[in-house]
């Protein structure tokens, strides 16, 4: 028995930040779970982890240097990634694992979300503007 995950096919991070919502076919209320976000086709980089438990506050961390936060809904976890670099444009996969109560459950691999990180394009004003026309 596998949990199904829905993600947006694509998101654009204009300001080097993005909210990625992972929607599950499972209610996480009063469950112990580990929700994670993975980067790359092979999911090689674990970007962020949200750990939830019926008795403790939500804990969010990244072991790989990403600036991330997480929010919990009844059937969703939203990852908020900040300070993304253009070269971190990639496909990102949501993963959910329920540790308690037994049995252990995880998800069918989702289709992922392509996060396209756009560089900040500031329009520079010329330092020495030419003489204005009459």
């Amino acid at each position: 028995n596998k949990i199904l995950v829905k993600q947006s096919p694509m998101l654009v991070a204009y300001d080097n930040a993005v909210n990625l919502s992972c929607k599950y076919s499972y209610n996480l209320f009063s469950r112990e779970f580990r929700a994670s976000l993975h980067k790359g086709l092979d999911s090689a980089v674990e970007v962020c982890v949200v750990y939830g438990n019926y008795s403790q506050q939500l804990q969010v961390y990244s072991k790989t240097g990403f600036n991330c936060d997480g929010k919990l809904g009844n059937e969703s976890v939203t990852f908020y990634l900040q300070n993304l670099y253009v070269n971190q444009t990639d496909i990102y996969f949501c993963k959910i694992e329920v540790m308690y109560p037994p049995p252990y459950l995880d998800n069918e691999k989702s289709n992922g979300t392509i996060i396209h990180v756009k560089g900040k394009h500031l329009c520079p004003s010329p330092l020495f503007p030419g003489p204005s026309k009459p």
């Epitope: 750990y51 072991k63 240097g65 037994p102 252990y104």
Partner: antibody
Amino acid sequence: QVQLVQSGAEVKKPGASVKVSCKASGYTFTSYYIHWVRQAPGQGLEWIGCIYPGNVNTNYNEKFKDRATLTVDTSISTAYMELSRLRSDDTAVYFCTRSHYGLDWNFDVWGQGTTVTVSS
Amino acid sequence: DIQMTQSPSSLSASVGDRVTITCHACQNIYVWLNWYQQKPGKAPKLLIYKASNLHTGVPSRFSGSGSGTDFTLTISSLQPEDFATYYCQQGQTYPYTFGGGTKVEIK
């Protein structure tokens, strides 16, 4: 209270196998990894590998990948570490320890250790 | 594998001394560094997790600091029960690795 209790000391001949057990109690077995760490006489600590009882996924130190086998029996909250093709330099104390599956970075509870002596 | 280098490998100190042990990681491990104390014939005990957090029940004379590649364990005023071997361990990526240990002996 939370406890990891290991099986007793073993004496084995070179080329044989040894299987050490680690019985967990006082916590939810499927919320934690079980890790195995060894310590040769007068030496430091060496991580062998770990197993997550929830889905039986394993991680091994490359050095032990072809000789160590980690298993669990969730019905009795017990983990096992089998080391095959024993050599004299496998003589060590073998510890089981745990790390949280959701917050996995440190070992907060340890077994008492199992001495394995390999001698002809 | 991430290599962890501890220094010194041993030191002699007196009761009441301030003791500092360092641990160097060969690559950036952010704050994913833990410290353990081990006494002869016993299993290691967790002292500090995530570089600077005191584990439950550990006396406040123990403290940890650092991030990235360089970390420090400090015992502010050495007590008789603190004579032991101390290990650092990185918990950033598998395989988890330990430093070689620092033996704290009585001067």
